[in-house]
Interface confidence: low
Amino acid sequence: KKVVLGKKGDTVELTCTASQKKSIQFHWKNSNQIKILGNQGSFLTKGPSKLNDRADSRRSLWDQGNFPLIIKNLKIEDSDTYICEVEDQKEEVQLLVFGLTANSDTHLLQGQSLTLTLESPPGSSPSVQCRSPRGKNIQGGKTLSVSQLELQDSGTWTCTVLQNQKKVEFKIDIVVLAFQKASSIVYKKEGEQVEFSFPLAFTVEKLTGSGELWWQAERASSSKSWITFDLKNKEVSVKRVTQDPKLQMGKKLPLHLTLPQALPQYAGSGNLTLALEAKTGKLHQEVNLVVMRATQLQKNLTCEVWGPTSPKLMLSLKLENKEAKVSKREKAVWVLNPEAGMWQCLLSDSGQVLLESNIKVLPTWSTPVQP
């Protein structure tokens, strides 16, 4: 018996061929011997089966001795043995219809679980193997779960259902709702304006929800909420903002925050959370602020940084073309009795300059000037 696999919602064509290459009488029946369709001369006739409005054939092929049964909008319950009666012959075709669906929604938050459920006809024992957009293979039976979805899991999942050495392939588009970056870091000199941007890694027609930026300043013992906002159809409106610092927020996506001045007391880490309407859980993006200050007090020239720096960062203070004073472990570097000239404070990581600040040291009888 020939086995054909079909996909729920799709169209399947079951073939039936006569030895005579001409239009002759044929009938398609199901396993209960109920007629589905057949012909009377050149007319298509239909029986009382449940498939009535979804069954068809191709009259253009009858003259060649081909009498296909076409079933549209397949349902799991269409799984059955179909019998084609032609020329006193009976051709049996077993049709197995499978469906594969994602749990609740194909738009999932980063970190959530994706469950794919296989609908299969009674008596079948299929195996499923799914390949994620990043090439990982996951296998299972009737249900298949992937925990902790990552941004890279966004895209088309290709799932192959295997039954009786036959395969049917499903493609499911999954959108992982996340910020483009899990974390970002901004380096600023004291007094400069700071721009924080939180671009989303997905696009949807309507986006509604609410968000908040919590900030843990390096110098503070506890974190505090700097701003809360609402999002309605991609329009941003501020609900509440602290007085110090007074953040400004852009009215359109991507989410954009401006801190008027980078000050040492603001250096630290923030966590922006976004709760989307009709979704459980929140999107998160970490943002870090590093602030540099170069000062001269009496006979001491100091360069300091505040905020989350990695162990690979290097802080240096140098006078034009002279040897630099470097600190790898401390977040401050200083020179006593500095020579007159333009001093440069540099924060670098593996040779790449992240932040620089210049300070002019005047001869000892003058006061310093900061450009």
Epitope: S113, R134, N137, I138, Q139, S145, V146, S147, Q152
Partner: antibody, heavy 120, light 113 residues
Framework: QVQLVQSGAEVKKPGASVKVSCKAS????????ITWVRQAPGQGLEWVGW????????GYSQKFQGRVTMTRDTSTSTVYMELSSLRSEDTAVYYC?????????????WGQGTTVTVSS | DIVMTQSPDSLAVSLGERATINCKSS????????????LAWYQQKPGQPPKLLIY???TRESGVPDRFSGSGSGTDFTLTISSLQAEDVAVYYC?????????FGQGTKLEIK
């Protein structure tokens, strides 16, 4: 620092099954998958499959499909690889390994290896 | 499956000299979405598990001496040891992790001439 410690050597008869364990310690929250790789005497490295110690999700090499089962016990941070219907060509050192850096499936942490000998 | 082919199978190099091992994949292991090559190099000494030297084709694992370097993209890759030391005698393997099944090269045995 993550460490992987494997169970001791095994000697099995053809047709039997073997179950090798791999216990993870130190920063196991960084582990998203533990992979099994085997090496027959004097031969190269061969990937067997992987298991996610948190979810239990698995992915097996087609070659071992139907003969290998990978499981985990979250309470002891241990994963297991069971290979059934053993044959002489399954004689090998079986390693568990895991990536802990951002390098996806480039394995920077390896177990010491478990020698499995299949002999009648 | 992606087939990894290393050349040569064995190599003898004098101490202090440069050693070069090649690895070819049957299909590209460059991910356009990450713009990274999913390729790693390992060193294995007798009785020991493999040791990761290089990942993303050219990123050196921490603690690996800088005489080891990886290069190449797409299907052709090279591991270079700029100045061979006695402790570098081992078998070297390349590995792709672009897609399952993960596959390794057959190995290159490096000896001192």
């Amino acid at each position: 620092q993550v460490q992987l410690v494997q169970s001791g050597a095994e000697v099995k008869k053809p047709g039997a099954s073997v179950k090798v364990s791999c216990k993870a310690s130190g920063g196991t929250q960084n582990i998203y998958a533990i992979t099994w790789v085997r090496q027959a005497p004097g031969q190269g490295l061969e990937w067997v499959g992987w298991v996610n110690p948190n979810s239990g999700n698995t992915g097996y090499s087609q070659k071992f499909q139907g003969r290998v089962t990978m499981t985990r016990d979250t309470s002891t941070s241990t994963v297991y690889m069971e290979l059934s219907s053993l044959r002489s060509e399954d004689t090998a050192v079986y390693y568990c390994a895991t990536p802990t850096s951002s390098s996806d499936d480039a394995f920077d942490i390896w177990g010491q290896g478990t020698t499995v000998t299949v002999s009648s | 499956d992606i087939v990894m082919t290393q050349s040569p199978d064995s190599l003898a190099v004098s101490l202090g000299e440069r050693a070069t091992i090649n690895c070819k994949s049957s299909q590209s292991v460059l991910s356009s979405s990450y713009n990274k090559n999913f390729l790693a190099w390992y060193q294995q000494k007798p009785g020991q598990p493999p040791k990761l030297l290089i990942y993303w084709a050219s990123t050196r694992e921490s603690g690996v001496p800088d005489r080891f370097s990886g290069s190449g993209s797409g299907t052709d890759f090279t591991l270079t040891i700029s100045s061979l030391q006695a402790e570098d005698v081992a078998v070297y393997y390349c590995q792709q992790y672009y897609s399952d099944p993960i596959t390794f090269g057959q190995g290159t045995k490096l000896e001192i001439k």
